[in-house]
Amino acid sequence: MMTGTIETTGNISAEKGGSIILQCHLSSTTAQVTQVNWEQQDQLLAICNADLGWHISPSFKDRVAPGPGLGLTLQSLTVNDTGEYFCIYHTYPDGTYTGRIFLEVLESSVAEHGARFQIP
């Protein structure tokens, strides 16, 4: 039975040209995290494998940095970066947990962080 929950940074906003940290945290389970995949809508951004380390997709290599922890840092943000981001936790023996973050990249300097929320 899957008992874990993913806590994410929720709905967040950031300024164009700036950077943002995408973070997820898996709790309430003793399952072993074997890999975390970070995806933007339908594109793979990065993979963090427990044994193999980090792989940043070639399309994002120049502006995505691994970490902190299992999180991901997006740099040189553009308005096109607005959208949904997913952290996909592959665990043993539970299976897959998915967290969702919505990022809005703003032209102005009125970028505020949204509240944290949980996805079961």
């Epitope: 793979l44 494998n49 792989h55 997709s57 399309s59």
Partner: antibody, heavy 121, light 107 residues
Framework: DVQLQESGPGLVKPSQSLSLTCTVT?????????WIWIRQFPGNKVEWMGY???????SYNPSLKSRISFTRDTSKNQFFLQLTSVTTEDTATYYC??????????????WGQGTSVTVSS | DIVMTQSHKFMSTSIGDRVSITCKAS??????VAWYQQKPGQSPKLLIY???YRYTGVPDRFTGSRSGTDFTFTISSVQAEDLAVYYC?????????FGGGTKLEIK
């Protein structure tokens, strides 16, 4: 340039263990990367068997987990495959390969030439 | 495990033709698909990784693309040395899995 070379017995009897060696030249297996075993059955089906990393961590294909183990000899820059309780279904060409996860994800960029293994009494 | 299906075991082509080989993943693999070329008596060689990125030294007549869980490998103008078996492989999650292969033959 990195080179990998598989070696081992060409013929193994059913129920016995299969042991293969991969000798790596041109790169230290303890420096980086994951080192892979893959096999190709007659008829061309390819199966990923698992890896041993530069730090010695291992991961196995669950379909083989009860029968497979990877070890290494860092002084000889070799890594090994042992497969127990073999059957005729294990007849295949066995390849060792390198996985540069940082650059290519789980794609294998260097392969050995392969060694053919027949399981037969 | 993720199943990678190459629906054509054989494909016939002529030198100079454009040819496309397809591969379908049984579930979401995002852009994590590689393509290999294997000539008779040789080991597989990496051509494409991350769905569309050419490996070092691979000629630009080889391209890869993706639509959902469908992946396509294209040779824009087939050369004699391209006659081989081509495999797709998902590198999204272990155990990494391969398609059954597509053999490119001359008509």
């Amino acid at each position: 340039d990195v080179q990998l070379q598989e070696s081992g017995p060409g013929l193994v009897k059913p129920s016995q263990s299969l042991s293969l060696t991969c000798t790596v030249t041109g790169y230290s297996i303890t420096s980086d990367y994951a080192w892979i075993w893959i096999r190709q059955f007659p008829g061309n089906k390819v199966e990923w068997m698992g890896y041993i990393t530069s730090s010695g961590s291992t991961s196995y294909n669950p379909s083989l987990k009860s029968r497979i183990s990877f070890t290494r000899d860092t002084s000889k820059n070799q890594f090994f495959l042992q497969l127990t309780s073999v059957t005729t279904e294990d007849t295949a060409t066995y390849y060792c390969a390198r996985l540069d996860f940082g650059n290519y994800g789980g794609a294998m960029d260097y392969w050995g030439q392969g060694t053919s293994v027949t399981v037969s009494s | 495990d993720i199943v990678m299906t190459q629906s054509h075991k054989f494909m016939s082509t002529s030198i100079g033709d454009r040819v496309s080989i397809t591969c379908k993943a049984s579930q979401h693999v995002s852009t994590a698909v590689a393509w290999y070329q294997q000539k008779p008596g040789q080991s597989p060689k990496l051509l494409i990784y991350s769905a569309s990125y050419r490996y070092t030294g691979v000629p630009d007549r080889f391209t890869g693309s993706r639509s959902g869980t469908d992946f396509t490998f294209t040779i824009s103008s087939v050369q004699a040395e391209d006659l081989a078996v081509y495999y797709c492989q998902q590198h999204y999650i272990t155990p990494y899995t391969f398609g059954g292969g597509t053999k490119l033959e001359i008509k």
